[in-house]
């Protein structure tokens, strides 16, 4: 229940990639505004996105404080121009979000191949270690800093002249693979967290091929 001119938010959804985390909901407001609160299971509620007409709220700053915690958010609905008004039970109308644990649930962003270098019949492929908004000692941590060995990369590679793919894995950000001399290869990588049950894999990176500017060749 609530006042006659407000409706509760619904379809509260967490959208999170590499810990950049936004709570979205419906409906688009008509004569009402929203305020969001977030807390850990054992913590106090903190208000964000005060009296907004948006249907999203960036909660990144809160969840990066401890990405292994489980968070709950709620969205309050108020009549526009009368935010002191409450529901029939004496408090504003609100709806709870699903629980969200960033470390287990944030989507893995599309990785990028930073470089590749050929030395004879070996190629070293390096994956860019993307910076996140998670901080430690006043510095932003990379994806590898946050996930450590929980994060692996899968490399797909194939000769430019054929369709048969090969694959390799690394729990660092570098691959060292064997190639045939004189052949050009193309590469794509995918991030994976094997221990997860949801949001386990990223999309594939853009394909990079030898003979393009990212690469370097040495005899």
């Amino acid at each position: 229940s609530g006042t006659t001119n407000t409706v509760a938010a619904y379809n509260l959804t967490w959208k999170s990639t590499n810990f950049k985390t936004i709570l979205e909901w419906e409906p688009k407001p008509v004569n009402q505004v929203y305020t969001v609160q977030i807390s850990t299971k054992s913590g106090d509620w903190k208000s964000k996105c005060f009296y907004t007409t948006d249907t999203e709220c960036d909660l990144t700053d809160e969840i990066v404080k401890d990405v292994k915690q489980t968070y709950l958010a709620r969205v309050f609905s108020y009549p526009a121009g009368n935010v002191e008004s409450t529901g029939s039970a004496g408090e504003p109308l609100y709806e709870n979000s699903p629980e969200f644990t960033p470390y287990l649930e944030t989507n893995l962003g599309q990785p990028t191949i930073q470089s590749f270098e050929q030395v004879g019949t070996k190629v070293n492929v390096t994956v860019e270690d993307e910076r996140t908004l998670v901080r430690r000692n006043n510095t932003f941590l990379s994806l590898r800093d946050v996930f450590g060995k929980d994060l692996i990369y899968t490399l797909y590679y194939w000769k430019s002249s054929s369709s048969g793919k090969k694959t390799a894995k690394t729990n660092t950000n570098e691959f060292l693979i064997d190639v045939d001399k004189g052949e050009n290869y193309c590469f794509s990588v995918q991030a994976v967290i094997p221990s997860r049950t949801v949001n386990r894999k990223s999309t594939d990176s853009p394909v990079e091929c030898m003979g393009q500017e990212k690469g370097e060749f040495r005899e």
Epitope: A168, K169, P194, D204
Partner: antibody
Framework: EVQLVESGGGLVQPGGSLRLSCAAS????????MHWVRQAPGKGLEWVGL????????IYDPKFQDRATISADNSKNTAYLQMNSLRAEDTAVYYC??????????VGQGTLVTVSS | DIQMTQSPSSLSASVGDRVTITCRAS??????LNWYQQKPGKAWKVLIY???SLAEGVPSRFSGSGSGTDYTLTISSLQPEDFATYYC?????????AGQGTKVEIK
Amino acid sequence: EVQLVESGGGLVQPGGSLRLSCAASGFNIKEYYMHWVRQAPGKGLEWVGLIDPEQGNTIYDPKFQDRATISADNSKNTAYLQMNSLRAEDTAVYYCARDTAAYFDYVGQGTLVTVSS
Amino acid sequence: DIQMTQSPSSLSASVGDRVTITCRASRDIKSYLNWYQQKPGKAWKVLIYYATSLAEGVPSRFSGSGSGTDYTLTISSLQPEDFATYYCWQHGESPWTAGQGTKVEIK
């Protein structure tokens, strides 16, 4: 409960084809890699190939590259193995396996394919 | 392709014995080595992954060690249910390759 159920095995003539299915339940195949592995009678395990059902990437053991096609129908939560130009040496139990990227955590009971005239 | 050489191919042991199975890769596989157990007529199940990590639900009498090219599976005190065939698998690069298997039989 996670389950993998292979089907489509049976007697095939030399030179013929087979299409095996691996019906998954209890999880979404798009979240994992799906492999096919075979085991000839009294022999060890032999890897055929894998698919990433979400991205569509397939990888094969080079010895099967020209004869095997692994595919997936995400709407049916099912992976497939098509093998052509079958010979007696392809007689085996064919297993599908779910790969976490760290290990095969679930394996089906297998389906027996016998290649004989 | 990476070749995996597993030894012995079979062994006889008694309940309570310590059993060791080894696997050698033709080149460094950076601990992308798993051990699986297979019983007759059954699917195979993971025991050890990343060379040393015990899979969920696997008894602690199983352990894995090694790095580089040489890896070992140890059963500290063989139990009746451990009589089976054991395989090592490398999964660091394609094609995935398995050892030939070690059949552990009752003495």
